[in-house]
Amino acid sequence: MLRGGRRGQLGWHSWAAGPGSLLAWLILASAGAAPCPDACCPHGSSGLRCTRDGALDSLHHLPGAENLTELYIENQQHLQHLELRDLRGLGELRNLTIVKSGLRFVAPDAFHFTPRLSRLNLSFNALESLSWKTVQGLSLQELVLSGNPLHCSCALRWLQRWEEEGLGGVPEQKLQCHGQGPLAHMPNASCGVPTLKVQVPNASVDVGDDVLLRCQVEGRGLEQAGWILTELEQSATVMKSGGLPSLGLTLANVTSDLNRKNVTCWAENDVGRAEVSVQVNVSFPASVQLHTAVEMHHWCIPFSVDGQPAPSLRWLFNGSVLNETSFIFTEFLEPAANETVRHGCLRLNQPTHVNNGNYTLLAANPFGQASASIMAAFMDNPFEFNPEDPIPVSFSPVDTNSTSGDPVEKKDETPFGVSVAVGLAVFACLFLSTLLLVLNKCGRRNKFGINRPAVLAPEDGLAMSLHFMTLGGSSLSPTEGKGSGLQGHIIENPQYFSDACVHHIKRRDIVLKWELGEGAFGKVFLAECHNLLPEQDKMLVAVKALKEASESARQDFQREAELLTMLQHQHIVRFFGVCTEGRPLLMVFEYMRHGDLNRFLRSHGPDAKLLAGGEDVAPGPLGLGQLLAVASQVAAGMVYLAGLHFVHRDLATRNCLVGQGLVVKIGDFGMSRDIYSTDYYRVGGRTMLPIRWMPPESILYRKFTTESDVWSFGVVLWEIFTYGKQPWYQLSNTEAIDCITQGRELERPRACPPEVYAIMRGCWQREPQQRHSIKDVHARLQALAQAPPVYLDVLG
């Protein structure tokens, strides 16, 4: 409530300190501002300041509350409680300051209606404690509590942890417990969250059974406990029983949908909340679905199989067991975490007419067998040419079967002499050889002249993945790219990723910590993610938030997520999944603590101002063995991409990341064109090309292939051995283009042994076909990394 005074006119102007640094905020908090005749006065476009002494005793009915983003309250001795109802209408609130007031109690659910709150300053009040629940679910960047008579107890263990982990600007405040010394020194041995044990039946469970689960809760000061069953839906009839410390749960008449669904027991005390999730496996027989063969780089016969336990598979071709080879093999997509069904492909590498036929997939588990069959025709039999048939003479490379539609000649029914038969036979041979020649010429990308749309990525890239979005080779004409017919959308075979199982992560499981950077697409945050991996209840992740919410951005996001789900390799940055609940859309990646490889190399090179070591990297410049290890890991990631026929198109150290223990992975968060803008050459409107990493054919004809990636890898090697220098750093972009197209090579870096420079040069052959394969490059680097050459950098 307002205590006296009238409501001020809402003539908004900006809040002086803005959402700036903690320091600015603290100064503002203590310095006050110009006096205001009303209890609360508008401030900035969406702020409110309440500084008249003793004018408020609650925050009910603040003027223009629903649009407020900043609320500054000072000198309100009567404002002693902050509760859920006080902030009910403040859904847009970002910054809340209540300082030098009488605040004694903040309800655990006080900020339930202010989910966007990112800065909370409650300094110089009368707070003795603050529940962990108060800040639960908020992404607070700053929390200021200095100047409060805090009472050290387990209830403040969460705050002590924030101080230990450097969260929310808490460490700088050096919080004290009233008469008890620093909060940091508070004993916490007995301050644990509850411990939970969930007993699951060890016998196998069948459809229709009843299952009893029991959750034992132990710990001090238990407050409440329960079950989270949101994933179960119609998987079983649920009956809860018992209470603390032993909760019972009966799942009656279970269905197979219960598989992979989490049943979670939770308990809370004043220290925090604990959750334990279990899954009940319900046995059911195998089932299988087959879909029509689709052509990608390889052909794919898509399938879905289900069953618990997971069925084993067997392919039959025309009724006989099909033995898999490196040309015909089963490939699974990464399974969804919460279902038993698995999707995959029978991959056929460049099949011919001999592979046409009936494909059967047999799935079996101990509870039953199932099979499905499909006819697949990959190519007409080239030897079934009938001299009596009309001879097609026009070729269309767009046609699916390499010859055009209508016959040019009518079938002649008159019997001819031997000479005509011989003539026809000769013609047939000529026709076949011409056909093969045409297919060979027109169909470099596709052996059998069956064309599919190329996959083109927008040049400014949504993120890491879109750099990978070229399947096989692609060439962009100089007019393509942004602003042309592409309009920045990905063009692709629509069936390609339609079955990818993208893992969805709950928003409540993601706790944003702080911002790591910003790109054209949006921001990247460091976050803590709960329930992501079974072996860790929480882990640090990098979260990419999509700024734009347009339908096309959403579709790009979806496609990108599907693609990333497919890319699973120890040297490709791991993609955990997406969060699509609400806005913004989020992508969750593994967090690589040392950041991008370029920055890492520069900070661990001979020129680094301060060569800081760490627990996993020794101080001083990286040694030859380490440089080789880095190079070998990037090569391993590229071997994987090449094997999938993905063309990266922007391989550079800035687009690789370094994690704990000098683990290097390919991947970035789409910020390179913003952070490393000088590495790109702007062509036309918005197209930015990494010309210093590109081979002549990519610069001249926009031709991007696995071979152009090999060239880029050679440049990456050069970057590694120069500790992150920019290629052709002494030249402008146009000069660099001239050098590359004229065939000049980067010089051997000082730290680079001749053996490694020979590898670089093998990557920089002018003719793409002459370049070493990435597989060979990787093998050579691996061999060198295992036994680094003795190399002395003898300075002249």
Epitope: P285, A364, G368, Q369
Partner: antibody, heavy 120, light 106 residues
Framework: QVQLQQSGAELVKPGASVELSCTAS????????MHWVKQRPEQGLEWIGG????????IYVPKFQGKATITADTSSNTAYLQLSSLTSEDTAVYYC?????????????WGQGTSVTVSS | DIVLTQSPALMSASPGEKVTMTCSAS?????MYWYQQKPRSSPKPWIY???NLASGVPARFSGSGSGTSYSLTISSMEAEDAATYYC????????TFGGRTRLEIK
């Protein structure tokens, strides 16, 4: 090469229990499924049930549920069949068999069989 | 339960003769499996997935069928083929065997 060695013949009294063993060599039972099949004198074959030794999950024909218990010990690469409350109906040769490696669980290798005679 | 009925229960054939035995299922099964058993021996896998011969099985044997009707054929009977043959389904639990067909040489 793959072999399944079964324990020797058993003569047991009605109402008693018996445990038969089947020791595998030439492969790891954890990688397959292990089955037990019954053949009464001059009769056909009857599948009793099987076990996935990797996790201990079992499956039985309903008529043998309660009569037969299948277990496995991966450290000794051995599967077991325990038969309880024996009657003359249980007099038979019991075979252990390996579920086809990696595909449809059909039985590709069989033990030599263990003869169980229930008689007072 | 799926009941498998084998016929004939007993048959004899002369060397060189073509032999066909059938296995009929009470409801549709995806595939049929066949085993051969000789006196005082364990059964041996003979045909799996309806038409695929187990290793070591002579090419004169073949299997065919679908749905509820399956058969095992010997194109030219030989003395060593005299044995008892069982069909088995692995489509749904309980995994039943057929009653058996005893094949003798004339």
């Amino acid at each position: 090469q793959v072999q399944l060695q079964q324990s020797g013949a058993e003569l047991v009294k009605p109402g008693a229990s018996v445990e038969l063993s089947c020791t595998a060599s030439g492969f790891n039972i954890k990688d397959t499924y292990m089955h037990w099949v019954k053949q009464r004198p001059e009769q056909g074959l009857e599948w009793i049930g099987g076990i996935d030794p990797a996790n201990g999950n079992t499956i039985y024909v309903p008529k043998f549920q309660g009569k037969a218990t299948i277990t496995a010990d991966t450290s000794s690469n051995t599967a077991y069949l325990q038969l309880s409350s024996l009657t003359s109906e249980d007099t038979a040769v019991y075979y252990c068999a390996r579920g086809g490696y990696d595909f449809d669980y059909a039985m590709d290798y069989w033990g030599q069989g263990t003869s169980v005679t229930v008689s007072s | 339960d799926i009941v498998l009925t084998q016929s004939p229960a007993l048959m004899s054939a002369s060397p060189g003769e073509k032999v066909t035995m059938t296995c009929s299922a009470s409801s549709s099964v995806s595939y049929m499996y066949w085993y051969q058993q000789k006196p005082r021996s364990s059964p041996k896998p003979w045909i799996y997935l309806t038409s695929n011969l187990a290793s070591g099985v002579p090419a004169r044997f073949s299997g065919s069928g679908s749905g509820t009707s399956y058969s095992l054929t010997i194109s030219s009977m030989e003395a060593e083929d005299a044995a008892t043959y069982y069909c088995q389904q692995w489509s749904s639990n309980p995994y039943t065997f057929g009653g058996r067909t005893r094949l003798e040489i004339k």
